[in-house]
Amino acid sequence: ALDTNYCFSSTEKNCCVRQLYIDFRKDLGWKWIHEPKGYHANFCLGPCPYIWSLDTQYSKVLALYNQHNPGASAAPCCVPQALEPLPIVYYVGRKPKVEQLSNMIVRSCKCS
Amino acid sequence: ALDTNYCFSSTEKNCCVRQLYIDFRKDLGWKWIHEPKGYHANFCLGPCPYIWSLDTQYSKVLALYNQHNPGASAAPCCVPQALEPLPIVYYVGRKPKVEQLSNMIVRSCKCS
C-alpha cells in the first residue's frame, strides 16, 4: 500500500503519500481553531506508471494507453485513498468544544 | 456536475471530462476483443482551483492551502468520479461471449 509506513521510509519517486504540515492560521487563514495550531495533512504526489497501485479498470486501461501513447495528456493521477479525521478544540464563547473534522489526514494514495 | 453534458458542450479550462477514443488494438495492443474495435473512454483534465467540484473536506482544505501557497506542489487533481461499464464481444474458440467490462467509461470528474 502507498501509505505513510511505506512512503515516509522510502525515496519512492512514483505516486506516494508525502509529508505536509498545515498551519491553520498561516496556511488557511482560520483563527477560530484553538487546538491544534496545525496538523500533518500530508498529500499525494508522483507519476502513475503502468502498473502502480491503480484504482479501477479504467485507470489500468488509461495507464496502458499512456504507455502506448507517451505524449498523451490523458494519464492517471496520484490522489488520496485513505483519509482520517482530525480532532480539534474550538471555543463557543468561553466554552471549549471538541469536534472531529472528517477526512482531513491522508494516510495513503492511489492512482486514479 | 463536471459531466459529459456540461464539459463536452463548453470550453471549460478547469477540471472537466474530455473526449478520448481508445482503439483496442492500436492504443492498448489488445487483439482479443471482437466488438467494439474501440470506445469513447474519455479522461479528466484541468486545474482544480478553489472551489471547483472538490471531493472531500481534505481536497477543500488542500485547495485553500494552495490558494494561500500558490507555489506549493500539493494540489488537488482532476480524476474520474462516475464510471460506466462497456459491453464487449470476444470469442472463446468459435463461440462468441458477451461481457460487461466494469468502470471503463468516464462520465464525470472531480477534484480529489
Epitope: 477560530w32 474550538y90 471555543y91 463557543v92 464563547g93 468561553r94 466554552k95 | 472551489i51 473536506q57 477543500k60
Partner: antibody, heavy 121, light 107 residues
Framework: EVQLVQSGAEVKKPGASVKVSCKTS????????MNWVRQAPGAGLDWMGQ????????NYNEMFEGRVTLTADTSTSTAYMELSSLRAGDIAVYYC??????????????WGQGTLVTVSS | DIVMTQTPPSLSVSPRETASISCRAS??????????MHWYLQKPGQSPQLLIY???NLESGVSDRFSGSGSGTDFTLRISRVEANDTGVYYC?????????FGQGTK
C-alpha cells in the same frame, strides 16, 4: 463582492415548519461560520445559532434548541434554517449573517436581506 | 446568559453634533486581552451593518466619524458630526459568552 440572498416571505399555519434559504456568493462559503438571527416586529435581535458548512458543525441558542435545524449545501453555497412547531411568537424577520472569521461566536460582517415569516391560522 | 442594556432607548441629535450611546453588559466581556463587543447600525428597512469590531476597531468601509471605546462591562459608541444618513437603530453585541446576545437597541 460578498452577497447573501435569502428566500422570499412565508406564511405558515401554527404547528407547521418553515425552511428559509440563504444563497451566498463572493466568498468561500464552506469555511466561514454562518449565523441566523431573528427580529420580531418592532423588537431587537435574537441570535438563533450557527453552522460551519464544511463539516456541518452547529451551535444553537438554547432558547431555540430542539425547534431549529441549521444545514448547509456546499455544492450550491447555500445555508438553510428550518424552524418547526411554529407559533404566533415566531412571527419575525429571519436573517442569515456571515461570521467575521476570528472566532466561532463572532461579529457578523455580511447580512442577508431578511425573510419575513408570518404565522397565521 | 449575558444581558446587554443600552441607554438611551432613543436619541434625537441635530446635524453636525456628536451622539453617544452606552452599552452595559451584565458581566465582563473581556477575555484574552480583547473586549468582545461590537456595534451595528440598522437603517430603516435594511439589514444591520457592522460598524465597530472588538470594542474599538472600525470596520472596513465605515466612516471614521464612528468610534468605539470601553472595556469590561461598559462600552460607548460615538458618532461625531452626525448626518441625516446616520438615522436608524444602533445595537451592541457581545460574543464572549454563549449565547451571543444583542442590546435592545437605541433609536
Amino acid at each position: 463582492e460578498v452577497q447573501l440572498v435569502q428566500s422570499g416571505a412565508e406564511v405558515k399555519k401554527p404547528g407547521a415548519s418553515v425552511k428559509v434559504s440563504c444563497k451566498t456568493s463572493g466568498y468561500t462559503f464552506m469555511f466561514y461560520w454562518m449565523n441566523w438571527v431573528r427580529q420580531a416586529p418592532g423588537a431587537g435581535l435574537d441570535w438563533m445559532g450557527q453552522i460551519f458548512p464544511a463539516w456541518g458543525m452547529t451551535n444553537y441558542n438554547e432558547m431555540f434548541e430542539g425547534r431549529v435545524t441549521l444545514t448547509a449545501d456546499t455544492s450550491t453555497s447555500t445555508a438553510y434554517m428550518e424552524l418547526s412547531s411554529l407559533r404566533a411568537g415566531d412571527i419575525a424577520v429571519y436573517y442569515c449573517a456571515r461570521g467575521y472569521g476570528n472566532y466561532a461566536l463572532d461579529a457578523m460582517d455580511y447580512w442577508g436581506q431578511g425573510t419575513l415569516v408570518t404565522v397565521s391560522s | 446568559d449575558i444581558v446587554m442594556t443600552q441607554t438611551p432607548p432613543s436619541l434625537s441629535v441635530s446635524p453636525r453634533e456628536t451622539a453617544s450611546i452606552s452599552c452595559r453588559a451584565s458581566e465582563s466581556v473581556d477575555s484574552y486581552g480583547n473586549s468582545f463587543m461590537h456595534w451595528y447600525l440598522q437603517k430603516p428597512g435594511q439589514s444591520p451593518q457592522l460598524l465597530i469590531y472588538l470594542a474599538s476597531n472600525l470596520e472596513s468601509g465605515v466612516s471614521d466619524r464612528f468610534s468605539g471605546s470601553g472595556s469590561g462591562t461598559d462600552f460607548t459608541l460615538r458618532i461625531s458630526r452626525v448626518e441625516a444618513n446616520d438615522t436608524g437603530v444602533y445595537y451592541c453585541q457581545q460574543n464572549d459568552e454563549d449565547p451571543l446576545s444583542f442590546g435592545q437597541g437605541t433609536k
